[in-house]
């Protein structure tokens, strides 16, 4: 028969012969022969390969460096890489999560629209009319101004995006 020029899925062509690729979690140690299948070996303790492959070396698992604020979110296996995330109060600087930065705080006049996660920073929004924030915080939303009317009080000092209204007693009618 004619030697093959292309091979099936999960095979590779070598020396006019189709050999099986190694399954995820294993590396190539010797091509198939006319008598035997491909020889593959499991990846070592801290290594992985996540595809059908003919790699001769497994990849090292990612190291979640605590000095960079990283911790392990999901331990790697022979078929998957380790997934890192950031310590509490920090978030990844990139999709690959190679280092972390402190979550930003929303300044006075801004409230938290979305609390930060291990992979995304805090999202702030300006406090709209009727709301305020007087602190720098990574958690606090804009608070509504106090409603003086519901307390049978009147506004003595108007609120801003950074301050609440000041309520006071209503002026008494003079006799």
């Amino acid at each position: 028969p004619e030697p093959p020029t292309a091979c099936r899925e999960k095979q590779y062509l070598i020396n006019s012969q189709c050999c099986s690729l190694c399954q995820p979690g294993q590396k190539l140690v010797s091509d198939c022969t006319e008598f035997t299948e491909t020889e593959c070996l499991p990846c070592g303790e801290s290594e992985f390969l996540d595809t059908w492959n003919r790699e001769t070396h497994c990849h090292q698992h990612k190291y979640c460096d605590p000095n960079l604020g990283l911790r392990v979110q999901q331990k790697g296996t022979s078929e998957t890489d380790t997934i890192c995330t950031c310590e509490e109060g920090w978030h990844c600087t990139s999709e690959a999560c190679e280092s972390c930065v402190l979550h930003r705080s929303c300044s006075p006049g801004f409230g938290v629209k979305q609390i930060a996660t291990g992979v995304s920073d805090t999202i702030c929004e300006p406090c709209p009319v009727g709301f305020f924030s007087n602190v720098s915080s990574a958690f606090e939303k804009c608070h509504p101004w106090t409603s003086c009317e519901t307390k049978d009080l009147v506004v003595q000092q108007a609120g801003t995006n950074k301050t609440d209204v000041v309520c006071g007693p209503q002026d008494r009618l003079r006799a």
């Epitope: 070598i14 140690v29 010797s30 091509d31 022969t33 008598f35 020889e39």
Partner: antibody, heavy 110, light 111 residues
Framework: LEESGGRLVTPGTPLTLTCTVS????????MNWVRQAPGKGLEWIGY?????SAGYASWAKGRFTISKTSTTVDLKISSPTTEDTATYFC?????????WGPGTLVTVSS | AQVLTQTPSPVSAPVGGTVTINCQSS????????LAWYQQKPGQPPKLLIY???KLASGVPSRFKGSGSGTQFTLTISGVQCDDAATYYC???????????FGGGTEVVVK
Amino acid sequence: LEESGGRLVTPGTPLTLTCTVSGFDLSSNAMNWVRQAPGKGLEWIGYITISGSAGYASWAKGRFTISKTSTTVDLKISSPTTEDTATYFCARGYNTMAIWGPGTLVTVSS
Amino acid sequence: AQVLTQTPSPVSAPVGGTVTINCQSSQNVLINNRLAWYQQKPGQPPKLLIYDASKLASGVPSRFKGSGSGTQFTLTISGVQCDDAATYYCQAGYSSGDGNAFGGGTEVVVK
């Protein structure tokens, strides 16, 4: 596979055996050296991996060195003794020795 | 170092009979299945029969059968033929630091 370099040597004379390969690539195949003393069983000496790192039987460490080029695999016997008299085979594979050469005879005698 | 013990030796069988050769490893073989069987006739290199404990090498007659896992393995030759007279070796692969090892061999005599 074809082994060469086997001959009569005196004890202590270094000797290098060569296995010449054709029809496959050493960059994606491991190779083993195995020997067989006259009338005795098979004895694994060592292998060389795809990456070029060698592994040896515990008794063979320090006495034998395996190395390779793109088409040959060498076995160096640093200081042969009469106990090293044997037919030496090279075989293709890592844990499974699928294809063997015919062997080359080494005789160590004074 | 690992030791592979083959039993019995020698073994004889009539034509058409069955031969069973055992191979015991002093430690688990790699992935529990990295064990091969070879046939050797005088003046020839060994020939691979079985690999990964039970896979038949291409071109080898189906009367040869391998079984076992971990430390205990068996080669069975059913319907023995005159041509099967030879010495049979088991060979195991171990984790990378320990490499490979051969059993002592079993001579099969066909009567």
